[in-house]
């Protein structure tokens, strides 16, 4: 003998977050008379999704006109799907009863899986800057994706990195997942312009992976090299001494001239020149009045770079010899814009 069956033809339905899910249900008979209800989950804790008879279900619409007595199609649409909507949905036929309707037959269930895109990967580097030859760690995080399968790659200037560790959480079943990866990068002096890229590939992205980037300019500190040279005499009894500060990054730099250990002048690097690799050069001049000194003068160029302990370079200026014959004839790297440094 024929008896009403509730057919849910789709064992599973996969929907992208934000889209509408159609859950199909057909009753194979118009009798017994009674409403259909949709539930998520089974058992006592099941959640009512739609009740044909009563209630307000703003996100749910019926595919067919359920007011027609000859309707057999009890499919529903759920709008604006989120990962939280994932689960197994059951179409349940009730038989009209008094005082309450009685559950008569349930469909086999349709598992709704939600495809959710991962959030844009956020790459963060170390809190403090590090110098070349040091290894630094970068982290990459992306959240809210489903299903769990995901691929993460690290690149430095287009070259794939291999030294990284990745975790996808949680380990068990969940409505959505997060990925966390830590990569180790060895810094070089040429890394001011370098970029570290975290690339995330997921089924929802249709082959167009998401990328998060970190500029190594935020991470690296390239300490300067100093060179102090004595220039030809500019005027009688005056010697021009230059301190060339080369290949430093970032720009934050303070230079102090000391004459025999006493502070002569302090200045902050302003008009710098940039090298192709992104590091900076700067030059400071000190005009020393030789006639003011009876003894030899020890000139020190002391540089404090990016809050680090000062480094210095000294030059001994002999006052006994004739100024015109003194020192080296090394040409200064004079850009013209540094004239204000000449005292």
């Amino acid at each position: 003998e024929e008896e009403l069956q509730v057919i849910q033809p789709d064992k599973s339905v996969l929907v992208a977050a934000g889209e509408t899910a159609t859950l199909r249900c057909t009753a194979t008979s118009l009798i017994p008379v009674g409403p259909i209800q949709w539930f998520r989950g089974a058992g006592p804790g099941r959640e009512l999704i739609y009740n044909q008879k009563e209630g307000h279900f703003p996100r749910v619409t019926t595919v067919s006109d359920l007011t027609k007595r000859n309707n057999m199609d009890f499919s529903i649409r759920i709008g604006n799907i989120t990962p939280a909507d994932a689960g197994t949905y059951y179409c349940v036929k009730f038989r009209k009863g008094s005082p309450d309707d009685v559950e008569f037959k349930s469909g086999a269930g349709t598992e709704l899986s939600v495809r959710a895109k991962p959030s844009a990967p956020v790459v963060s580097g170390p809190a403090a800057r590090a110098t070349p030859q040091h290894t630094v760690s970068f982290t990459c995080e992306s959240h809210g994706f489903s299903p769990r399968d995901i691929t993460l790659k690290w690149f430095k200037n287009g070259n794939e990195l291999s030294d990284f560790q990745t975790n996808v959480d949680p380990v068990g079943e969940s409505v959505s997942y997060s990925i966390h990866s830590t990569a180790k990068v060895v810094l070089t002096r040429e890394d001011v312009h370098s970029q570290v890229i975290c690339e995330v590939a997921h089924v929802t992205l249709q082959g167009d992976p998401l990328r998060g980037t970190a500029n190594l300019s935020e991470t690296i500190r390239v300490p300067p090299t100093l060179e102090v040279t004595q220039q030809p005499v500019r005027a009688e009894n005056q010697v021009n001494v230059t301190c060339q500060v080369r290949k430093f990054y970032p720009q934050r730099l303070q230079l102090t001239w000391l004459e025999n250990g006493n502070v002569s002048r302090t200045e902050t690097a302003s008009t710098v020149t940039e090298n192709k690799d992104g590091t900076y050069n700067w030059m400071s001049w000190l005009l020393v009045n030789v006639s003011a000194h009876r003894d030899d003068v020890k000139l020190t160029c002391q540089v404090e770079h990016d809050g680090q302990p000062a480094v210095s370079k000294s030059h001994d200026l002999k006052v006994s010899a004739h100024p015109k014959e003194q020192g080296s004839n090394t040409a200064a790297e004079n850009t013209g814009s540094n004239e204000r440094n000449i005292y």
Epitope: E1, E2, L4, T22, R24, T26, T28, S29, L30, I31, V63, S64, D65, K68, N70, N71, M72, D73, S75
Partner: antibody
Framework: QVQLVESGGGVVQPGRSLRLSCAAS????????MHWVRQAPGKGLEWVAV????????LYADSVKGRFTISRDNSKNTLYLQMDSLRAEDTAVYYC???????????????WGQGTMVTVSS | DIQMTQSPSSLSASVGDRVTITCQAS??????LNWYQQKPGKAPKLLIY???NLETGVPSRFSGSGSGTDFTFTISSLQPEDIATYYC?????????FGGGTKVEIK
């Protein structure tokens, strides 16, 4: 006026395929469930398949399940029946039909086409 | 599937006669039953829906009754244009099924 016109019938060898079309006019095609019903020569009527007004639900008779596919193009007001792996017993006049009940599958067929003959023979 | 047994399979009656056709369902189908008329070489035409409701435009000499398993279709006064085969169809259960048909002829 309301009209359904079938086409695509013909003689075909067993195991081959055929695609029937049903052009609808005179009513809001996209609001109604649509059916295919067939009638073997000198025999009675047999329901074949139904498709919901929006294509979301499709049901088939056991005799054609897995071989026939019902579909529709609401932008063209056209119903289709793709018939694969045809057998001699599929020889029949194929009618498309609909009911006057909007937004349901509707099984009281008040509008019928004139039918198209499909002959499956080697 | 629900079996629909129609009887007689054919009948011959005179113009003006009352003609009765019966349709029996293999189990209770409530009143979800339709009656169709099919003239030779033509598509079927819906006459009665939900066992007893006359389709718009159908002459009142056609009527239907019954519920559960037993249904009756009646032509109160047979007319020459009524020569056709008549089918019952249930749609309580899927798939919808038709009776074998009753061929009505004029004596």
């Amino acid at each position: 006026q309301v009209q359904l016109v079938e086409s695509g019938g013909g003689v075909v060898q067993p195991g081959r395929s055929l695609r029937l079309s049903c052009a609808a006019s005179g009513f809001t095609f996209s609001s109604y469930g649509m059916h295919w019903v067939r009638q073997a020569p000198g025999k009675g009527l047999e329901w074949v398949a139904v498709i919901a007004y929006d294509g979301s639900n499709k049901l088939y008779a056991d005799s054609v399940k897995g071989r026939f596919t019902i579909s529709r193009d609401n932008s063209k007001n056209t119903l289709y029946l793709q018939m694969d792996s045809l057998r001699a017993e599929d020889t029949a006049v194929y009618y498309c039909a609909t009911s006057d009940t909007k937004y349901t599958l509707g099984f009281a067929f008040d509008i019928w086409g004139q039918g198209t003959m499909v002959t499956v023979s080697s | 599937d629900i079996q629909m047994t129609q009887s007689p399979s054919s009948l011959s009656a005179s113009v003006g006669d009352r003609v009765t056709i019966t349709c029996q369902a293999s189990q209770d189908i409530s009143n979800y039953l339709n009656w169709y008329q099919q003239k030779p070489g033509k598509a079927p035409k819906l006459l009665i829906y939900d066992a007893s409701n006359l389709e718009t435009g159908v002459p009142s000499r056609f009527s239907g009754s019954g519920s559960g398993t037993d249904f009756t279709f009646t032509i109160s006064s047979l007319q020459p244009e009524d020569i056709a085969t008549y089918y019952c169809q249930q749609f309580t259960y899927l798939p919808p099924t038709f009776g074998g048909g009753t061929k009505v002829e004029i004596k």
